[in-house]
């Protein structure tokens, strides 16, 4: 099936890297600069992706691959291919709207993108706060009071705070 | 593949009550913000109501307040908009649109018509 | 009547540069980024510049934002005529705790 493919249509044999060239009786043309074909085949090359501005280049173009962007420093990628660049925060913030806030009380953030998440809640599990939360870190959790030799003592869990109500900005 | 698809668009009476759904697909949905945008025939867009992560922050367009309500089912992957006291107004193609935390509409569904008429 | 006031069209031809502008309040463009949003006929929006200035992955160059005081602008240069869509300008409003949206300028490439 192949061969018989390939005698009605010569572009079939164009490998990667070129392209089928109807103005030279379709014979197969290397990509010209700046543009590759990742498949064989192809009757056009595609433009390669310049990563300009706030996206800085991860792997070069070539013939056969498109270029790949990340982010420059201070922001990191979104959506598929990095497709978008968005600011990183501190530890203990979140973007928001309008640029990074701290976590509000009862939430942490340990890394510099994403959201501020809800610190474990202990007795869910029985056990007791061993070390407190922070707007950076969960709170460890330790043995449940009951396993505590007597004598011995945890830190008091704090009080399940309501979030007070703020603004997404 | 990164994919947003409503449902429950219809025909509906002045006075009567839908409820949207769009599913998500592609990303972490809990992760992100969520909005409900509508288009009215010929006319521009309108954001109607957005979500928080955890589902403890909404906002909606004036207009709709205390009758519509959005909602998230994070389980689900799945964005919800009940609509009640429908307006011959509230006519128009509803889609829902990831917001980074940034704030930009990166991703859209491809929109449900909503026919509000007696 | 929408919170953001853009012309309700535009219109260039192939190669020309064109701009959008797009008119605020301190409550919105004068706090807030922008974004400019392209539809085309029959499909869903997209995102063309986020941030006042930044452009997806995807956007050709050709499309510029920027921002100054309680106004900002698209701008379109090279004109082609793939670029004639609707255009939307949004930011978020502070007093309205909503976002908004300008009324739209239909782009027309003769």
């Known amino acids: 099936f192949e061969r018989t493919r390939s005698l009605q249509d010569p572009c079939s044999n164009c490998p990667a890297g070129t392209f089928c060239d109807n103005n030279r009786n379709q014979i197969c043309s290397p990509c010209p600069p700046n543009s590759f074909s990742s498949a064989g085949g192809q009757r056009t090359c595609d433009i390669c992706r310049q990563c300009k501005g706030v996206f800085r280049t991860r792997k070069e173009c070539s013939s056969t691959s498109n270029a790949e962007c990340d982010c420059t420093p201070g922001f990191h990628c979104l959506g598929a291919g990095c497709s978008m660049c968005e600011q990183d925060c501190k530890q203990g913030q979140e973007l928001t709207k309008k640029g990074c806030k701290d976590c509000c009380f009862g939430t942490f953030n340990d890394q510099k993108r994403g959201i501020c998440r809800p610190w474990t809640n202990c007795s869910l599990d029985g056990k007791s706060v061993l070390v407190n939360g922070t707007k950076e870190r969960d709170v460890v959790c330790g043995p449940s009071p009951a396993d505590l030799s007597p004598g011995a003592s945890s830190v008091t869990p704090p009080a399940p705070a309501r979030e007070p109500g703020h603004s997404p900005q | 593949e990164v994919q947003l698809l409503e449902s429950g668009g219809g025909l509906v009476q002045p006075g009567g009550s839908l409820r949207l759904s769009c599913a998500a697909s592609?990303?972490?949905?809990?992760?992100?913000?969520m909005s409900w945008v509508r288009q009215a025939p010929g006319k521009g867009l309108e954001w109607v109501a957005n979500?928080?992560?955890?589902?403890?922050?909404?906002y909606s367009v004036d207009s709709v307040k205390g009758r519509f309500t959005i909602s998230r089912d994070n389980s689900k992957n799945t964005l919800y908009l009940q609509m009640n006291s429908l307006r011959a107004e509230d006519t128009a193609v509803y889609y829902c649109a990831r917001e980074t935390n940034g704030g930009a509409f990166d991703i859209w569904g491809q929109g449900t018509l909503v026919t509000v008429s007696s | 009547q929408s919170v953001l006031t853009q012309p309700p069209s535009a219109s260039g031809t192939p190669g020309q540069r064109v701009t959008i502008s797009c008119s605020g309040s301190s409550s919105n463009i004068g706090s807030n980024y922008v974004y400019w949003y392209q539809q085309l006929p029959g499909t869903a929006p997209k995102l063309l510049i986020y941030?006042?200035?930044q452009r997806p992955s995807g956007v050709p160059d050709r499309f510029s934002g920027s921002k100054s005081g309680t106004s900002a602008s698209l701008a379109i240069s090279g004109l082609r005529s793939e670029d004639e869509a609707d255009y939307y300008c949004?930011?978020?409003?502070?007093?309205?705790?909503?976002?908004?949206f300008g009324g739209g300028t239909k782009l027309t490439v003769l």
């Open positions: 941030r006042n200035n």
């Open positions: 592609g990303f972490t949905f809990s992760n992100a913000w």
């Open positions: 979500i928080k992560q955890d589902g403890s922050e909404k």
């Open positions: 949004a930011a978020w409003d502070d007093s309205l705790s909503g976002w908004v």
